[in-house]
């Protein structure tokens, strides 16, 4: 059913009720548009900093990966660990911080065509959902081969961010993915998403643009832990 899918890892890393940010080369990700709750269009974010148990990387924040906390530790006990910075050892892409990927066992800087796995997944539409087209005709959402040669403009269907033109990333929109603008300075972003706050990742957002990272807005430090606003800010 839809609900079981929404609570599964098929649609993940989303503070209720909307979506997270698409994974990023180059900055901490702006996960959900903020964890958006109804109420005067106010943004509320949730950040939990305690060790978070996980089974796979996608259950962790975008600046974390899932692994045993100790070398050779019990593989059955895994938690979200801080991502590894450039030039640190790695075994897979997810271990490297946004903006890097794992090459020959070392985290190296990404170019525009390397993105973290979170939104690289091929999105399927077998969600027990009715996907009717507005004109009553069936419409394929897979990319034509032509799309791979012409970078997708805003609103184009995509599979990964490298399918999109510069300044855009591939992010979820309902049960498809489309090219959306990368976040600019001052726009709301969210970090440290936790499985407990997964929900409906339907309107996903892009990551913060180059030279920006997702941080707590200074005038929101005094706010309660459950409503701290993150925005894309200069490094």
């Amino acid at each position: 059913t839809l609900n079981s899918v929404l609570n599964s890892n098929a649609i993940k890393n989303l503070p209720p009720p909307l979506g997270g940010a698409a994974g990023h080369p180059g900055s901490a990700v702006s996960a959900a548009p903020g964890i958006l709750y109804p109420g005067g269009n106010k943004y509320q974010t949730i950040d939990n900093y305690q060790p978070y148990p996980c089974a796979e990387d996608e259950e962790c924040g975008t600046d974390e990966y899932c692994a045993s906390p100790t070398r050779g530790g019990d593989a059955g006990v895994q938690i979200c660990l801080a991502c590894r910075k450039r030039r640190k050892r790695c075994m897979r892409h997810a271990m490297c911080c946004p903006g890097n990927y794992c090459k020959n066992g070392i985290c190296v800087s990404s170019d525009q065509n390397h993105f973290r796995g979170e939104i690289e997944e091929t999105i399927t539409e077998s969600f027990g959902n009715d996907h009717s087209t507005l004109d009553g005709y069936s419409r394929r959402t897979t990319l034509s081969s032509k799309m791979y040669h012409t970078k997708g403009q805003e609103g184009s269907v995509c599979l990964r961010s490298s399918d999109c033109a510069s300044g855009l990333c591939c992010a979820r929109h309902f049960w498809s993915k489309i090219c959306k603008p990368v976040l600019k300075e001052g726009q709301v972003c969210t970090k440290h998403r936790r499985k407990g706050s997964h929900g409906l990742e339907i309107f996903q957002r892009c990551y913060c643009g180059e030279g920006l990272s997702c941080r707590i807005q200074k005038d929101h430090h005094q706010a309660s832990n459950s409503s701290r606003l993150h925005t894309c800010q200069r490094h």
């Epitope: 909307l18 929109h173 498809s176 489309i178 959306k180 603008p181």
Partner: nanobody
Framework: EVQLVESGGGLVRAGGSLRLSCAAS????????MGWFRHAPGKEREFVAG????????YYADSVKGRFTISGDNAKNTVYLQMNSLKPEDTAVYYC??????????WGQGTQVTVSS
């Protein structure tokens, strides 16, 4: 900043109908699509139906398929949810949300729908 205002909620008997409206104002960017969600006491917030202007598609939760119909007019910044054959389990606060091209997502304040048996 975009403001979303829902209306049309109310008290209705099981089997009855309601039509919810959601109007967006203050939009300076286009919207990719809009959706309806609901939140019943003691339950998780759930997706109900959505409409993608960008993809020309509508989406429904299994629980409302065949009973609810989403429609709208992107030019008028409005989305509707026609709810037929209502059941007591449809009782909830219904929220409208918008996927905006300015990279923000917005929520309305919600409208209460109560279905009595």
């Amino acid at each position: 900043e975009v403001q979303l205002v829902e209306s049309g909620g109310g008290l209705v008997r099981a089997g009855g109908s309601l039509r919810l409206s959601c109007a967006a104002s203050g939009r300076t960017f286009s919207s990719y699509g809009m959706g309806w969600f609901r939140h019943a006491p003691g339950k998780e917030r759930e997706f109900v139906a959505g409409i993608s202007w960008t993809l020309g598609r509508t989406y429904y939760a299994d629980s409302v398929k065949g009973r609810f119909t989403i429609s709208g007019d992107n030019a008028k910044n409005t989305v509707y949810l026609q709810m037929n054959s209502l059941k007591p389990e449809d009782t909830a606060v219904y929220y409208c949300a918008s996927d905006e091209s300015d990279a923000a997502n917005y929520w309305g304040q919600g409208t209460q729908v109560t279905v009595s048996s």
